[in-house]
């Protein structure tokens, strides 16, 4: 038969950061290829990554159409060299993915401190607003555009000369903090969606930036 000796995919896993979303699976193919289909709960199946020998498929273009929908994917296995034939009635082996809701489940990418500026005993720290591949009206949206006030940032800051950390929070991309005059400080930020109750609630910490280096500016 047309699908003999093909193995169903397994370990289907969603890998998603800032809505860039890839479905991965096993096994590495031996004499077989894969086609992926994706659908919302109420929608039709759409085929992607036709007859690929890869074990991953970039589904970003589909999920960014509505990041609040819940998606399901499935991976079909075909014999290598398979050509679609209209007469074939036998369904190839396939495996379903877990459900995936991008808005709730995409990981937050590592943030970047865009700049910091000191004026007297105040420092304004700005976090870069990352662009995503989510679109509305042919415009790409930033992370802040998508999440609005659901997204907060936590700032960790400390004197270069000590290890005691302080924290501040903002629901924008800017912090205004008090510092001691004449002291240099170091900064790191983390993106957080407080309403999430899962492991993907927080991003990794940004790279550390310290005063006295090129990102900063000081004015008396």
């Amino acid at each position: 038969s047309g699908t003999t000796n093909t193995v169903a995919a397994y370990n289907l896993t969603w890998k998603s950061t800032n809505f860039k979303t890839i479905l991965e699976w096993e096994p590495k193919p031996i004499n077989q290829v894969y086609t992926v289909q994706i659908s919302t709960k109420s929608g039709d199946w759409k085929s992607k990554c036709f007859y690929t020998a890869d074990t991953e498929c970039d589904l970003t273009d589909e999920i960014v159409k509505d990041v609040k929908q819940t998606y399901l994917a499935r991976v079909f296995s075909y014999p290598a060299g398979h050509v679609e034939s209209t007469g074939s009635t036998e369904e190839p082996p396939y495996e379903n993915s877990p459900e995936f809701t991008p808005y709730l489940e995409t990981n937050l990418g590592q943030p970047t401190i865009q700049s910091f500026e000191q004026v007297g005993t105040k420092v304004n720290v700005t976090v870069q607003d990352e662009w995503t591949l989510v679109r509305r009206n042919d415009t790409f949206l930033s992370l802040r555009d998508v999440f609005g006030k659901d997204l907060i940032y936590t700032l960790y800051y400390w004197k270069s000369s000590s290890s005691g950390k302080k924290t501040a929070k903002t629901n924008t991309n800017e912090f205004l903090i008090d510092v001691d005059k004449g002291e240099n400080y170091c900064f790191s930020v983390q993106a957080v969606i407080p309403s999430r109750r899962t492991a993907n609630r927080k991003s990794t910490d940004s790279p550390v930036e310290c005063m006295g280096h090129e990102k900063g500016e000081s004015r008396e």
Partner: antibody
């Protein structure tokens, strides 16, 4: 085509309760927010409140308590209820789609508006 | 109380000329840039022109442009047309969850 439309207003008496519905088509309320805005005759625009794409509601400080926005009646409708109507509530009421889905102030699709008159 | 103060009405503009309308917020708007501009003609609903301070809404002519950051914002109409006669409103979101506000409106008269 994406659109929003308010139900018909009309003439109401002081202390009456007003319920307006906003029917949306061509887009999902799970992805876009809806705001209610009113405009008294000859006056400017006044934001009443917003229901975001997660179903959370936000109100202007002056509207809190007497105004209620909800979307639990039907999948494509958002309701505005106003209790204890007064003459000062006489206005054209608009519903509009929030472009970002949260309470952003960017309202990209508006209904034609419906006139509500409160008079004894 | 949140306040958006706009250029006083009316503002006169000549066909082919340029008009600017200012909008000043009593505190920084949300993330310094979530401010929108609307055009409203009598008997019609408002129309979104600009969002996020400077992004042109779909279908709006490029004669309209927006700028600003924090508390000070400007709508500029260049090569003014007769059809631009209308009242223009700014609107903003604020960091406080519950707050969105409209400015008082600026009427533009085209001569």
């Amino acid at each position: 085509k994406q659109s929003v439309e308010e139900s018909e207003g009309g003439l109401f008496k002081p202390t009456d309760t007003l319920t307006l519905t906003c029917t949306v088509s061509g887009f999902s309320l799970s992805y876009y927010g809806v705001s209610w805005v009113r405009q008294a005759p000859g006056n400017g625009l006044e934001w009443i409140g917003t229901i975001d794409s997660s179903g959370r509601t936000y109100y202007a400080s002056w509207a809190n308590g007497r105004f209620t926005i909800s979307n639990d009646n039907a999948p494509n409708t958002v309701s505005l209820q106003v209790n204890s109507l007064a003459a000062a509530d006489t206005a054209t009421y608009f519903c509009a789609r929030d472009f970002y889905g949260w309470n952003s102030g960017a309202l990209d699709i508006w209904g034609p508006g419906t006139l509500v008159t409160v008079s004894s | 109380e949140l306040d958006l103060t706009q250029t006083a009405s009316p503002v006169s503009a000549a066909v082919g000329g340029t008009v600017t309308i200012n909008c000043q917020a009593s505190q920084s708007v949300y993330s310094n840039k979530y401010l929108s501009w609307y055009q409203q003609k009598p008997g019609q609903p408002p129309k979104l022109l600009i969002y996020k301070a400077s992004t042109l809404a779909s279908g709006v002519p490029s004669r309209f442009s927006g700028s600003g950051f924090g508390t000070e914002f400007t709508l500029t109409i260049s090569d003014v047309q007769c059809d631009d006669a209308a009242t223009y409103y700014c609107a903003a979101a604020y960091s406080d969850d519950s707050d969105t506000a409209f400015g008082g409106g600026t009427k533009v008269v085209v001569e």
